[in-house]
């Protein structure tokens, strides 16, 4: 094939090599950019900055090499449009630093930075950590800081992410109240801070106030939906990012719902209870306290992480006629109590038979599957015992 005279020439089916001395000062308008998976750049002394707009449209890029060039600055968001980037070689450039934000969100298998005049500071604490943890092939590079010695020896005692303290009200919060949260941010080189309120939706009216180092947040006219929702304060400095999440407990009275008993492998009287604080529960059977045993007990379903309502069953393992009756669920918390009742009829008396009647005990030879923690059983083809009305 004839030599390629352009600044950048195709390499393989989805690669591009740009090696002609001084031909590039930016990466705008590279040919076939949207399909590129590999980009190799060398000897580009005028290529000094790498910014967000430079890599727009390179969504398929996996490998990026910029070596022996004049790169001095890589923007923190430079690789926002290249989420699939896995190998990044920026060796032998003029980089003094590289922000932790630059590689955040990427799954880099390889990061090469050797041959750069790195300046040891807290801004490179993340890179030192990569070296300590053996990430991205960094340890093998034995990175040096210009005139300061090995990166591994950089003192880091003062290199911490911001420290956050979120103050929440001590007192009970009721529906309709206004709640003031304050986030105190401490640390060196604070850059940005804010609140993440994505979970709140219609739980309150939100008003932000203040700025670093003390951020305020007013949640006005709160609803019970605010319970279990995260309110997150975040802050960043040159070392990294810190987040602290809190939840505001909004008190509201107990409520309860009962549903008709359903037969599964066992019987279940389904219920839902709500309230903050979580209500205590008590079952009554025909008006008397029901003692829970391995045959009759409360079983909760896995709770949803972001809501207070709990669903469950009063589980009955093979109940008989003595379990027929009125079931009441009482729920109570300091703000109120509630109850619901339901009649359940599981079976007529299976133990009384006409002496002349045969007792049907035929068994199927086929195993039935068990998913419930009950024994895998071989079960009757016909119901066990025909109920007979006794005069």
């Amino acid at each position: 094939a004839a030599p390629c005279p352009d600044a950048c020439c195709p390499h393989g089916s989805s690669g591009l090599r740009c090696t002609r001395d001084g031909a590039l000062d930016s990466l705008h308008h590279l040919p076939g950019a949207e399909n590129l998976t590999e980009l190799y750049i060398e000897n580009q002394q005028h290529l000094q900055h790498l910014e967000l707009r430079d890599l727009r449209g390179l969504g398929e890029l996996r490998n990026l090499t910029i070596v022996k060039s004049g790169l001095r600055f890589v923007a923190p968001d430079a690789f926002h449009f290249t989420p699939r980037l896995s190998r990044l070689n920026l060796s032998f450039n003029a980089l003094e630093s590289l922000s932790w934000k630059t590689v955040q969100g990427l799954s880099l298998q390889e990061l090469v930075l050797s041959g750069n005049p790195l300046h040891c500071s807290c801004a490179l604490r993340w890179l030192q950590r990569w070296e300590e943890e053996g990430l991205g092939g960094v340890p093998e590079q034995k990175l040096q800081c210009h005139g300061q010695g090995p990166l591994a020896h950089m003192p880091n005692a003062s290199c911490g992410v911001p420290t956050l303290k979120v103050q929440v009200p001590n007192a009970s919060v009721d529906v309709g109240d206004d709640v003031l949260l304050r986030c105190q941010v401490e640390g060196r080189g604070l850059e940005q801070a804010g609140w993440i309120l994505t979970e709140l939706e219609q739980s309150a009216t939100v008003m932000k106030s203040g700025g670093l180092p003390s951020l305020g947040l007013t949640l006005a006219n709160v609803t019970s939906d605010l319970n279990r929702k995260n309110v997150t304060c975040w802050a960043e400095n040159d070392v990294g990012r810190a987040e602290v999440s809190v939840q505001v407990n909004v008190s509201f009275p107990a409520s309860v719902q009962l549903h008709t008993a359903v037969e599964m492998h066992h019987w279940c009287i389904p219920f839902s209870v709500d309230g903050q604080p979580a209500p205590s529960l008590r079952w009554l059977f025909n008006g008397s306290v029901l003692n829970e045993t391995s045959f009759i007990f409360t079983e909760f379903l896995e709770p949803a992480a972001n809501e207070t309502v709990r669903h469950g069953c009063l589980r009955l393992n093979q109940p008989t006629h003595v379990n027929n009756g009125n079931y009441t669920l009482l729920a109570a918390n300091p703000f109120g109590q509630a109850s619901a009742s339901i009649m359940a009829a599981f079976m007529d008396n299976p133990f009384e038979f006409n002496p002349e009647d045969p007792i049907p005990v035929s068994f199927s030879p086929v195993d039935t599957n068990s998913t419930s923690g009950d024994p895998v059983e071989k079960k009757d083809e016909t119901p066990f015992g025909v109920s007979v009305a006794v005069g």
Epitope: N291, E292, T293, S294, F295, I296, F297, T298, E299, R315, N317, Q318, T320, H321, V322, P350, F351, V361, S372, G373, D374, P375, K379, D380, F384
Partner: antibody, heavy 115, light 108 residues
Framework: EVQLQESGPGLVKPSGTLSLTCAVS?????????WTWVRQPPGKGLEWIGE???????NYNPSLKSRVTISVDKSKNQFSLKLSSVTAADTAVYYC????????WGQGTLVTVSS | SSELTQDPAVSVALGQTVRITCQGA??????ASWYQQKPGQAPVLVIY???NRPSGIPDRFSGSSSGNTASLTITGAQAEDEADYYC???????????FGGGTKLTVL
């Protein structure tokens, strides 16, 4: 397949406390099952001691209630039996099992009460 | 009273049918379960609840109940069925479990 394994001292002094642990493997102690202890004196029948649910509910044999404590350790996936003020009459093979049907049992451990 | 009564011993000729019974007031209210125990071994569940048989238990074992009596029937007894058999159930209050005294089955 759920498996249960009892462990604890094989010899306890009279008036002392018998302590046994049952390790559950092949399933979670926090499942929808209760866990129980049963004992069998040499040459005699089975006696139910008590049962526990992972949420803390317990029921004990009325004849032993004043001396028995059953507890559960969810983090270790095990449950335990303590029987205080033991006498020679408490010498038995002690079994743990899954309630309510006792469909899985440990192999049993003989505890002798003797000075 | 909160107790279950079993015959101490029962025998059966090889291949014949045998019925082991368990009596108690609570059996008018609750199902019985049955356990087989061979010397030096832990008991094994053979019938539970409403006449259910766990996986792996031969279909010659069956359960029935009438009035205050629960029965375990072995249809065509085998030599390996020689063992102690225990019934259990809830007591009359429903709050505790009780065992019968056991029946020693001999297969002749």
């Amino acid at each position: 397949e759920v498996q249960l394994q009892e462990s604890g001292p094989g010899l306890v002094k009279p008036s002392g406390t018998l302590s046994l642990t049952c390790a559950v493997s092949g399933g979670s102690i926090s499942s929808s099952n209760w866990w129980t202890w049963v004992r069998q004196p040499p040459g005699k029948g089975l006696e139910w001691i008590g049962e526990i649910y992972h949420r803390g509910n317990r029921n004990y044999n009325p004849s032993l209630k004043s001396r028995v404590t059953i507890s559960v350790d969810k983090s270790k996936n095990q449950f335990s039996l303590k029987l205080s003020s033991v006498t020679a009459a408490d010498t038995a093979v002690y079994y743990c099992a899954r309630a309510p049907w006792f469909d899985y049992w440990g192999q049993g451990t003989l505890v002798t009460v003797s000075s | 009273s909160s107790e279950l009564t079993q015959d101490p011993a029962v025998s059966v000729a090889l291949g014949q049918t045998v019925r082991i019974t368990c009596q108690g007031a609570s059996l008018r209210s609750y199902y019985a379960s049955w356990y087989q125990q061979k010397p030096g071994q832990a008991p094994v569940l053979v019938i539970y609840g409403k006449g259910n048989r766990p996986s792996g238990i031969p279909d010659r074992f069956s359960g029935s109940s009438s009035g205050n009596t629960a029965s375990l029937t072995i249809t065509g007894a085998q030599a390996e069925d020689e063992a102690d058999y225990y019934c259990n159930s809830q007591d009359s209050s429903g709050n505790h479990l009780i065992f019968g005294g056991g029946t020693k089955l001999t297969v002749l």
